[in-house]
């Protein structure tokens, strides 16, 4: 599985490195953390135990999405 990969970037355009996820059952994982009044920070990569999730906090929001097709 080919996934885009990055850590704590402020733009999708900085998340264009491609990682080959070789472990059985891995998915592509995207985390978006948005702090109130600040930029959204994006991280992407491979994950063995990815679960779609969305959590609201007093100071912002965290959103995790999972997918399992190349470059999704």
């Amino acid at each position: 599985l080919l996934c885009y990969s990055c850590k704590a970037q402020v733009s999708n355009e900085d998340c264009l490195q491609v990682e080959n996820c070789t472990q059985l059952g891995e998915q592509c994982w995207t985390a978006r953390i948005r702090a109130v009044g600040l930029l959204t920070v994006i991280s992407k990569g491979c994950s063995l135990n990815c679960v779609d999730d969305s959590q609201d906090y007093y100071v912002g929001k965290k959103n995790i999405t999972c997918c399992d097709t190349d470059l999704c």
């Epitope: 599985l1 080919l2 885009y4 999708n12 355009e13 264009l16 491609v18 779609d52 999405t65 999972c66 997918c67 399992d68 097709t69 190349d70 470059l71 999704c72």
Partner: antibody
């Protein structure tokens, strides 16, 4: 309405080059990844290139890798395919197509252009 | 690469017939399969996506099913305007590949 219009096809000699263009209208071009797909005379469909929405990521099958280059100009709502070192087997109708997502993982080519014909012959 | 095998490569049927086209894949692709219709001399058009979802404007006589490596496109009651070549395509793994096509004619 949503539309893709290709241009730039023609007759070229083996080893020559050609640049195809695809003009998009009726949708926010910069929000979609795009592809080129070709169809040789009397044959089936073959995907030949992919570019993401911003233009920073591209992929090709081995049949064209190193010879074809896909690019885009979001300010001009245009997609391009630069084809170098052309071979007789590259003769085909070339379509540009929009990649539409359904959910997080699944996608499909939902809009196709009318195609432009490339003939490689001496 | 994932190989896509369509069968039959061509078939003829009468108006009103139930028509079935199959698509097999060399690897498990979950439900990441699309079907396209190309009428003679025309551009391919999306027919069905994600195995079974009808694209907007597609008549309800078309349906899709399957999962894993075996997929089916069914036309419940063939109409004259259904004369076309039908292609399956997988969107799971690069390089994205199409089946060889099934040419459908009406008797």
């Amino acid at each position: 309405q949503v539309q893709l219009v290709e241009s730039g096809g023609g007759l070229v000699k083996p080893g020559g080059s050609l640049r195809l263009s695809c003009a998009a209208s009726g949708f926010t071009f910069s929000s979609y990844s795009m592809s080129w797909i070709r169809q040789a005379p009397g044959k089936g469909l073959e995907w030949v290139s992919y570019i993401n929405d911003s233009g920073g990521s591209t992929f090709y099958p081995d049949t064209v890798k190193g010879r074809f280059t896909i690019s885009r100009d979001n300010a001009k709502n245009s997609l391009y395919l630069q084809m170098n070192s052309l071979r007789a087997e590259d003769t085909a109708v070339y379509y540009c197509a929009r990649r539409m997502y359904y959910g997080n993982s699944h996608w499909h080519f939902d809009v196709w252009g009318q195609g432009t014909t490339v003939t490689v012959s001496s | 690469d994932i190989q896509m095998t369509q069968s039959p490569s061509s078939l003829s049927a009468s108006v009103g017939d139930r028509v079935t086209i199959t698509c097999g894949t060399s690897q498990d692709i979950n439900n990441y399969l699309n079907w396209y219709q190309q009428k003679p001399g025309k551009v391919p058009k999306l027919l069905i996506y994600y195995t079974s979802r009808l694209h907007s404007g597609v008549p309800s006589r078309f349906s899709g099913s399957g999962s894993g490596t075996d997929f089916t496109l069914t036309i419940s009651s063939l109409q004259p305007e259904d004369v076309a070549t039908y292609y399956c395509q997988q969107s799971k793994t690069l390089p994205w590949t199409f089946g060889g096509g099934t040419q459908l004619t009406v008797l």
